[in-house]
């Protein structure tokens, strides 16, 4: 069962921090780890390793802990004030503008460009024209125009939300 | 005596809008969190939203998700749905309700939904 | 989300009998989290038990609530004529939060 908090355990200075969602402390506010009950009265342990919260709060319900997904590497367990961290794997990243899913990261730069930044989780190689130095825009490219090997396909999709 | 008293139901064209009331007496209002539930005809009890007793946490059911928006008035002790771009399958009576999670320990008498062309 | 199966579908007893309502989880609720309504035609639901097993206020003490995990029982020991109506379970562990589809008590 989860730990209960009284508004009166809680530190006056805790009562009425953040004071952003609210028109007073005495409609209460939760610290992180916790959630509100439904009648005001407690503040309620969010479940180690199931759901978390990380600011204050007046949640009826702590978060879902992310699960990672496979084509990913947890760089640090959820917790009870925090998510999971998940991370994709070697040689795949995660773009900003396609976040659920990693992609395999090329193997190499079209004709006449040279790599000038590895594969990362976050980004892909980075390939600058030889002679202008100007950045590949980031598509990849056909085989026939790869220095190296062909290009990887779309990993499988990696979620981000619990 | 705990008293939950809903209103602003009514017939609406599909892709219409409609606000539902439920005025609240007899508890500390903005101590309780508050749902709405609904009930199609013929039908069993389907939640809608729910929402915080300060209003800083909002809950929806899929189904309503970007459409029903849950809000309410502390000092005016009372609790709203905005129902926009309303749909046949959204037709049903809707019951004001106190509690979010462990019970619904009070209930309105329901206000009537119809969404009819 | 939490899809709870209520079981039977409709219940055909006679005053005095006992009724007994199953409701089951599709992933384990918390007994906190787990109540019964009652319904009857052209009214609002009334909340019976709450936790699982503790009656409501006003509730008679015929009405008994009982389980853990993903199953969970409501128990009528003898019908009274009031009694015959629909009964839901509710689970409020994880949004959104559900009710079962209802279990209809009638006179045989």
């Known amino acids: 069962e989860s730990a209960l908090i009284t508004q009166q355990d809680l530190a006056p200075q805790q009562r009425a921090a953040p004071q952003q969602k609210r028109s007073s402390p005495s409609e209460g506010l939760c610290p992180p780890g916790h959630h509100i009950s439904e009648d005001g009265r407690d503040c309620i342990s969010c479940k180690y390793g199931q759901d978390y919260s990380t600011h204050w709060n007046d949640l009826l319900f702590c978060l879902r802990c992310t699960r990672c997904d496979s084509g990913e590497v947890e760089l640090s367990p959820c917790t009870t004030t925090r998510n999971t961290v998940c991370q994709c794997e070697e040689g795949t990243f995660r773009e900003e503008d396609s976040p659920e899913m990693c992609r395999k990261c090329r193997t190499g730069c079209p004709r006449g460009m040279v790599k000038v930044g590895d594969c990362t989780p976050w980004s892909d190689i980075e390939c600058v024209h030889k002679e202008s130095g100007t950045k590949h825009s980031g598509e990849v490219p056909a085989v026939e125009e790869t220095v190296t090997s062909s290009p990887g396909t779309p990993a499988s999709p990696c979620s981000l939300s619990g | 005596e705990v008293q939950l008293l809903e209103s602003g139901g009514g017939l609406v064209q599909p892709g219409g809008s409609l606000r539902l009331s439920c005025a609240a007496s007899?508890?500390?209002?903005?101590?309780?969190?508050m749902s709405w539930v609904r009930q199609a005809p013929g039908k069993g009890l389907e939640w809608v939203s729910a929402?915080?007793?300060?209003?800083?946490?909002?809950y929806y059911a899929d189904s309503v998700k970007g459409r029903f928006t849950i809000s309410r008035d502390n000092s005016k002790n009372t609790l709203y749905l905005q129902m926009n771009s309303l749909r046949a399958e959204d037709a049903a009576v809707y019951y004001c309700?106190?509690?979010?999670?462990?019970?619904?320990?009070?209930w309105g008498q329901g206000t009537l939904v119809t969404v009819s062309s | 989300e939490i899809v709870l199966t209520q079981s039977p579908g409709t219940l055909s007893l006679s005053p005095g009998e006992r009724a007994t309502l199953s409701c089951r989880a599709s992933q384990s609720v918390s007994s906190s989290y787990l109540a019964w309504y009652q319904q009857k035609p052209g009214q609002a639901p009334r909340l019976l038990i709450y936790?699982?097993?503790s009656r409501a206020t006003g509730i008679p003490d015929r009405f008994s609530g009982s389980g853990s995990g993903t199953d969970f029982t409501l128990t009528i020991s003898r019908l009274e004529p009031e009694d015959f109506a629909v009964y839901y379970c509710q689970q409020g562990q994880l949004p959104p939060i559900t009710f079962g589809q209802g279990t209809k008590v009638e006179i045989k």
């Open positions: 936790g699982a097993s």
């Open positions: 007899g508890f500390t209002f903005s101590s309780y969190a």
């Open positions: 929402i915080s007793g300060s209003g800083g946490s909002t």
């Open positions: 309700a106190k509690g979010v999670r462990k019970k619904f320990d009070y």
